[in-house]
Interface confidence: medium
């Protein structure tokens, strides 16, 4: 229903705390360089204004759209052009073009320092002094680094953060209480960020229909007892929520997500038997819980998929009558029978089925033509199954760090033109799939592996789009989202690449590496590994292993030496010589 004042409506629906959090996230995602204090001031002004509209919906400017109100605030920031360059040009436009312009200027890789966690005592002190400001800083720092982070989910992570600090800051050993818990939240939040970015990419590049297909497959897997109309209702609502968040309409997004959670909990009987535990939780936890709820038990008496979609004499008639609904039904029926498949695979199968009907229904004997379609799915299913087996076997043999290195070599060979920091980030993220998925039961591995890899590769594509350097990457990133992962997997060594000349300084290290945290040490070593592959793209695994073992030994020796600096300056050049010889 239409409201006189949109801002008053959202403030009333969301409550002050969530309203302020969401406005802060919105501003931080649009203007990623501004300080927390600058944004906090704007948020307070917007909140005060919202309160005046709650008191009197007819007050001046209360009838303006949220985009207009927020855009006017952002455009009033002093020194906008100095700090943001051409983003300031957005302010010359009218809505809705102005908001579109802001969205286009969101930076997926802002040049901000990594978000450093203060040490435990300092963190607890500032948290106790002012929990609201502390959490505001958290929202601001995450949102500006992840401009497409799913806003209501970020509120959930902030709530988790808050609960951990409340608990751990009361303990004697704050550090050992905080570190593992906050590391866990950080890991989950980073995965949430790349997953959501993938959803926004799907929406931006291929439109609502593509996202809705993704949602139908995912929901059908989770809720196999819900009927097709129920699944499409949920998919339609979920598409709206995600469209709003991806479009920067964070208040509407959070409000509609709460509505969807409420609907699901009120209609458990027609959706799933597994929702009750989630529905007993408060709002943010409830919505989060529903988004990752376990799959309902599949109905025992499901007929073979072939009955409706291959053997039925009316297949072409049903398809012609309403293509979208017929294909949607196919996707629903296939997905509910296969919780063990990835959504990407299910969408590839639906695409294959559609292409088969398009071809066969135009022929003289359609049933003879489409009669083998399910058999033709086999290679499409085998490919990701083999990928999972091969990679999980490798992960089990090498462990996470070794597995990351194997992926780093593989991807540097596929796309050696890509910058080393991007390759290292991608390989480290891709390598985490082992820890995340390979330990799961067999029937959960494929969906976990492939859908996670797809999300990571989407980030590779986004970063590559900014500065395209590899034809291989451009080729894989230009196709449909669901074909990307198979495309990257199929890439081989880039034969067009001219190897980088050997630069000794690339492989020169100093004693400061010894005091780095383990993660930073790994990144330094992986940077060297990528550079080695760029120098010798056809180096064998054995050659690279020899060099990396030597390198690890060198670091170990010099970091234990009494005079570290001398060790590095004398042994370093010897290492470089040995590396060149080993790769000759």
């Amino acid at each position: 229903e239409a409201h006189k004042s949109e801002i008053a409506h959202r403030y009333n629906d969301l409550g002050e705390q969530h309203f302020k959090g969401l406005v802060l996230i919105a501003f931080s995602q649009y203007l990623q360089k501004c300080s927390y204090d600058e944004h906090a001031k704007l948020v307070q002004e917007v909140t005060d204004f919202a309160k005046t509209c709650v008191a009197d919906e007819s007050a001046a400017n209360c009838d303006k759209s949220l985009h207009t109100l927020f855009g006017d605030k952002l455009c009033a920031i002093p020194n906008l052009r100095e700090n943001y360059g051409e983003l300031a040009d957005c302010c010359t436009k009218q809505e809705p073009e102005r908001n579109e312009c802001f969205l286009q200027h969101k930076d997926d890789n802002p040049s901000l320092p990594p978000f450093e966690r203060p040490e435990a005592e300092a963190m607890c002190t500032s948290f106790k002094e002012n929990p609201t400001t502390f959490m505001g800083h958290y929202l601001h720092e995450v949102a500006r680094r992840h401009p497409y982070f799913y806003a209501p989910e970020l509120l959930y992570y902030a709530e988790q953060y808050n609960e951990i600090l409340t608990q751990c800051c009361a303990e004697a050993d704050k550090e050992s209480c905080l570190t593992p818990k906050l590391d866990g939240v950080k890991e989950k939040a980073l995965v949430s960020s790349v997953r959501q970015r993938m959803k926004c990419s799907s929406m931006q590049k291929f439109g609502e229909r593509a996202f809705k297909a993704w949602a139908v497959a995912r929901l059908s897997q989770t809720f196999p007892n819900a009927d097709f109309a129920e699944i499409t209702k949920l998919a339609t609502d979920l598409t709206k929520v995600n469209k709003e968040c991806c479009h920067g309409d964070l208040l509407e997004c959070a409000d509609d997500r709460a509505e969807l959670a409420k609907y699901m909990c009120e209609n458990q009987a027609t959706i799933s038997s597994k929702l009750q535990t989630c529905c007993d939780k408060p709002l943010l936890k409830k919505a989060h819980c529903l988004s990752e709820v376990e799959h309902d038990t599949m109905p025992a008496d499901l007929p073979a998929i072939a009955a409706d979609f291959v053997e039925d004499q009316e297949v072409c008639k049903n398809y012609a009558e309403a293509k979208d609904v017929f294909l949607g039904t196919f996707l629903y029926e296939y997905s509910r029978r296969h919780p063990d498949y990835s959504v990407s695979l299910l969408l590839r199968l639906a695409k294959k089925y559609e292409a088969t009907l398009e071809k066969c229904c135009a022929e003289a004997n359609p049933p003879a033509c489409y009669g083998t379609v399910l058999a033709e799915f086999q290679p499409l299913v085998e490919e990701p199954k083999n990928l999972v087996k091969t990679n999980c076997d490798l992960y089990e043999k090498l462990g996470e760090y070794g597995f990351q290195n194997a992926i780093l070599v593989r991807y540097t060979q596929k796309a050696p033109q890509v910058s080393t920091p991007t390759l290292v980030e991608a390989a480290r993220n891709l390598g985490r799939v082992g820890t995340k998925c390979c330990t799961l039961p067999e029937d959960q591995r494929l969906p976990c592996v492939e859908d996670y890899l797809s999300a990571i590769l989407n980030r590779v594509c986004l970063l590559h789009e900014k500065t395209p350097v590899s034809e291989h990457v451009t080729k894989c990133c230009s196709g449909s989202l669901v074909e990307r992962r198979p495309c990257f997997s199929a890439l081989t060594v880039d034969e067009t690449y001219v190897p980088k000349e050997f630069k000794a300084e690339t492989f020169t290290f100093h004693s400061d590496i010894c005091t780095l945290p383990e993660k930073e040490k790994q990144i330094k070593k992986q940077t060297a590994l990528a550079e080695l592959v760029k120098h010798k793209p056809k180096a064998t695994a054995e050659q690279l292993k020899t060099v990396m073992d030597d390198f690890a030994q060198f670091l170990d020796t010099c970091c234990k030496a009494a005079d570290k600096d001398t060790c590095f300056s004398t042994e370093g050049p010897n290492l470089v010589t040995r590396c060149k010889d080993a790769l000759a």
Epitope: N225, D227, F228, A229, E230, T232, K233, T236, Y263, N267, A269, T270, P299, P303, D308, D312, E314, N318, V325, F326, T329, Y332, E333
Partner: nanobody
Framework: EVQLLESGGGLVQPGGSLRLSCAAS????????MLWVRQAPGKGLEWVSV????????YYADSVKGRFTISRDNSKNTLYLQMNSLRAEDTAVYYC????????????WGQGTLVTVSS
Amino acid sequence: EVQLLESGGGLVQPGGSLRLSCAASGFTFDTSSMLWVRQAPGKGLEWVSVIHQSGTPTYYADSVKGRFTISRDNSKNTLYLQMNSLRAEDTAVYYCAKFPSSQFRFDYWGQGTLVTVSS
């Protein structure tokens, strides 16, 4: 026992309108998606429109999109089909059906109501 009773059919000129109703009983109507299907003389069953238990979303066969509107009143356990700009090819017996788990298999339907479009 599930009962579905359609009404509202009749003879109408091309371009005219009709509103079909379907009274439902014997099951929980407000948790069931519903649909209209039709059968033209000498032809097979053709689905026309589907409506979710809450009233949205709705789906239409391409042949009726923009002309027909499906709706429901859960307080009255009644399903409706508003048919505008009727054409000769809309002539058929219209059945309301309880929506099952599979799109093209219908669990229960009524005895139907005949719609004839002719000048």
